[in-house]
């Protein structure tokens, strides 16, 4: 079938990085600068993506593949092929419509993106709180009192007080 196709359509012989030039008797011409063709048999080359503004070039365009972009520091990619750049927040924050806001008491975010998530409820697994949670870190659950050897006591600090000057959002 391939041989038949190439007899019927000379363009099918044009490899990636070239296009079938109708103006030159359908010979294979190299893609012009700032364009590419990622598959063979193409009648045109595609314009390379330009990584500008808040986007920066992660991979240069070549004659056979498009440029790839990522985001300038302080931002991260969103969407297929990094179609958008979204603002980073600090750990212990989440991005809202009004910008980065601290996690509410009882929640945490250990990344620069994403939302604040509730601390683990150790008691649901019959465990105790070994290390209190913060805005940046989940609680660490310890062994349940039953798991402790006789005479040992569970390390269960009192419920954490609100941080000074920190009110729930």
């Amino acid at each position: 079938f391939e041989r038949t196709r190439s007899l019927q359509d000379p363009c099918s012989n044009c490899p990636a990085g070239t296009f079938c030039d109708n103006n030159r008797n359908q010979i294979c011409s190299p893609c012009p600068p700032n364009s590419f063709s990622s598959a063979g048999g193409q009648r045109t080359c595609d314009i390379c993506r330009q990584c500008k503004g808040v986007f920066r070039t992660r991979k240069e365009c070549s004659s056979t593949s498009n440029a790839e972009c990522d985001c300038t520091p302080g931002f991260h990619c969103l969407g297929a092929g990094c179609s958008m750049c979204e603002q980073d927040c600090k750990q212990g924050q989440e991005l809202t419509k009004k910008g980065c806001k601290d996690c509410c008491f009882g929640t945490f975010n250990d990344q620069k993106r994403g939302i604040c998530r509730p601390w683990t409820n150790c008691s649901l697994d019959g465990k105790s709180v070994l290390v209190n949670g913060t805005k940046e870190r989940d609680v660490v659950c310890g062994p349940s009192p039953a798991d402790l050897s006789p005479g040992a006591s569970s390390v269960t600090p009192p419920a954490p007080a609100r941080e000074p000057g920190h009110s729930p959002q």
């Epitope: 503004g53 808040v54 969103l78 179609s83 979204e86 603002q87 419509k97």
Partner: nanobody, 121 residues
Framework: QLQLVESGGGLVQPGGSLRLSCAAS????????IGWFRQAPGKEREGVLC????????IYADSVKGRFTISRDNAKNTVYLQMNSLKPEDTAVYYC??????????????WGQGTQVTVSS
Amino acid sequence: QLQLVESGGGLVQPGGSLRLSCAASGFTLADYAIGWFRQAPGKEREGVLCISSSGDVTIYADSVKGRFTISRDNAKNTVYLQMNSLKPEDTAVYYCVAPRICSTYSSDDYWGQGTQVTVSS
């Protein structure tokens, strides 16, 4: 033709002040957030400040806190970046950009051509 034009850059001594303007033509600035970015020689572009269409301010660069402020005059279709207590490390080309919201930028956003700010004695 939709465009943003920055102005107000120049040479200033350390500790001095400048006010940059970002004027829009061909579209209504009030419908957009406006962000200021800067790029120093040999460094990557850095977010500075952004003001939303409703006037909420986002600070991208901690280094400008307490020194730079952003404001908008929708009647004049212009946003201003007031820069006080300038330092040599503020030297850069300053660009304004018009995203829909301060938190998210796309390749469709309008960018200005930039204005040079040089802080030197």
